[in-house]
Amino acid sequence: TQNKALPENIKYGIVLDAGSSHTSLYIYKWPAEKENDTGVVHQVEECRVKGPGISKYVQKVNEIGIYLTDCMERAREVIPRSQHQETPVYLGATAGMRLLRMESEELADRVLDVVERSLSNYPFDFQGARIITGQEEGAYGWITINYLLGKFSQKTRWFSIVPYETNNQETFGALDLGGASTQITFVPQNQTTESPDNALQFRLYGKDYNVYTHSFLCYGKDQALWQKLAKDIQVASNEILRDPCFHPGYKKVVNVSDLYKTPCTKRFEMTLPFQQFEIQGIGNYQQCHQSVLELFNTSYCPYSQCAFNGIFLPPLQGDFGAFSAFYFVMNFLNLTSEKVSQEKVTEMMKKFCSQPWEEIKTSYAGVKEKYLSEYCFSGTYILSLLLQGYHFTADSWEHIHFIGKIQGSDAGWTLGYMLNLTNMIPAEQPLSTPLSHSTYV
């Protein structure tokens, strides 16, 4: 594709999602003459950068350039050379970098500075690297899924793009789970909000939206696990932690220094009489669930209703798309089907967690062990977060749709971010040009 003439005027955009556990590069394309239409932008490539998230490069910033090379070279390959100079590149860093910034603004700035210098060396139109806020992450995720589901379009279609799409224009709520934070974003029934911090107003395609959003820092699946370990080791009698969230027979040595490295475990930090401890899995869903619930403070709420930790949460409304790690984990566990009830999910989790580690390794040969070992915890955490954290019930569970992709594009904040920064979501409904919405004639 490198130098072939394009049959129509196609534009491209690149967004790098610098997450806490890894970085992914997304390439989007759209027909230039339709860039204000809804649903015309789609993802053509995802490239996962090898290695950890950029915040882990704080002590080796000189390696950041080489770290990004493979995926940036892939972008150079996928996007026609004639388009390189006009292709915008954006990098948004999320909770991993928010945590680093909490520890040291100077170190976070240094990492971003090196990232910017590295990305400026490519022939694209680099537009900057920044740490996006939790509110932005929630809002852009909400925009992405509703854009892809066609919820902003004023035209009713006689066909359905995806199985759970209805022809009504009610937007979907967005549930996003990362490694270091989790976001919940939706349009509540009641337009007035008790917490202005959680309120966003948008005008998109001629319609006003009053949106609730909150990002829970330290409640992504990886940081939640660190929190749980730090909490549980406080009461361990020796350097062995019998952990119900890992399979029977699983063993792993953890350095106490690694445990207390993150700001997320500060509230549990104490002087321990050992430098290392060993996790020994006992695989008990019920006990794991109980341990996870202790991470959510539900005893204090200064509003009419809260999620946890005193954060306002209005009554849940409508359907929700649950993506990123919500999807990856539930998909691995084979629990994404609309037909699987919450009770069935709990039952399956009990069974899964109790399976011996050696059996799990054999059954799932080829699944990376680091991830494989944590699915029991992650699945339990997801259930706890959705049910006790966000107050979904057995009945409202059926309103949660676990989504990986919508029409070939990953659900996540990156598309919404690019649409916003390239001004591709107009406030007003664009005037329809002749034939622009018709099928081919």
Epitope: E45, R48, K50, E73, R74, A365, E369
Partner: antibody, heavy 123, light 107 residues
Framework: QVQLKETGPGLVQPTQTLSITCTVS????????TQWVRQTPGKGLEWMGF???????QYNSAFKSRLSISRDTSKNQVFLKMNSLKTEDTGVYYC?????????????????WGQGASVTVSS | DIRMTQSPASLSASLGETVNIECLAS??????LAWYQKKPGKSPQLLIY???ALQNGVPSRFSGSGSGTHFSLKINSLQSEDVATYFC?????????FGGGTKLELR
């Protein structure tokens, strides 16, 4: 079926330049990376560098100043050139295929290797 | 550079025995580790990638495990054709690096 075949000079004088050609069949150079690895008596297996499907290169900094990798896609050939040879460069030079999985972030796995080109650096 | 240390450097085992080879990385490499088998005069063959994924066509008696810094290659029920040198390789960071090899022979 997938094959890679290295052809080299066998004997090279010290200070001279080594040139090896890797001819591939059964796959396209524009879909795979082509890696170079050598095995020397002193250092065992050493990764040297590679050329990506798009044509850009990555080198091991231990060789960077004297190594260059290029290709001719019309002939299905990849070329390794290394100058300023020393006796320690004596060994077997392999080209190998690397199937990049961008979605998974897996690249650097050498799934098919050539039979190797034996190189002796001696005067 | 990431150092890959293999142990033992050599070992002898009897037919039908189970063999374990260890590979230790000098820093966390996640699961970005491959195992290769090399017979004298032949080119290396890929056995395992991503720490534990079996390459197509490789007998199921070979298995890999581990993540982070500790990895192992296990050969169940050793066969005569398994006599070879085994190498591990990390591919998380440039330069990619190999272990020094483990020479396996029959007792």
């Amino acid at each position: 079926q997938v094959q890679l075949k290295e052809t080299g000079p066998g004997l090279v004088q010290p200070t001279q330049t080594l040139s090896i050609t890797c001819t591939v069949s059964g796959f396209s150079l524009t879909s795979y990376f082509t890696q170079w690895v050598r095995q020397t008596p002193g250092k065992g297996l050493e990764w040297m560098g590679f050329i990506r499907s798009g044509g850009s290169t990555q080198y091991n900094s231990a060789f960077k100043s004297r190594l260059s990798i290029s290709r001719d896609t019309s002939k299905n050939q990849v070329f390794l050139k290394m100058n300023s040879l020393k006796t320690e460069d004596t060994g077997v030079y392999y080209c190998a295929r690397d199937r990049p999985d961008y979605h998974d972030g897996t690249y650097g796995v050498l799934d098919v290797w050539g039979q190797g080109a034996s190189v002796t650096v001696s005067s | 550079d990431i150092r890959m240390t293999q142990s033992p450097a050599s070992l002898s085992a009897s037919l039908g025995e189970t063999v374990n080879i260890e590979c230790l990385a000098s820093e966390d490499i996640d699961s970005d580790l491959a195992w290769y088998q090399k017979k004298p005069g032949k080119s290396p063959q890929l056995l395992i990638y991503n720490g534990n994924a079996l390459q197509n066509g490789v007998p199921s008696r070979f298995s890999g495990s581990g993540s982070g810094t500790h990895f192992s290659l296990k050969i169940n029920s050793l066969q005569s054709e398994d006599v070879a040198t085994y190498f591990c390789q990390q591919y998380i960071n440039y330069p990619y690096t190999f272990g020094g090899g483990t020479k396996l022979e029959l007792r």
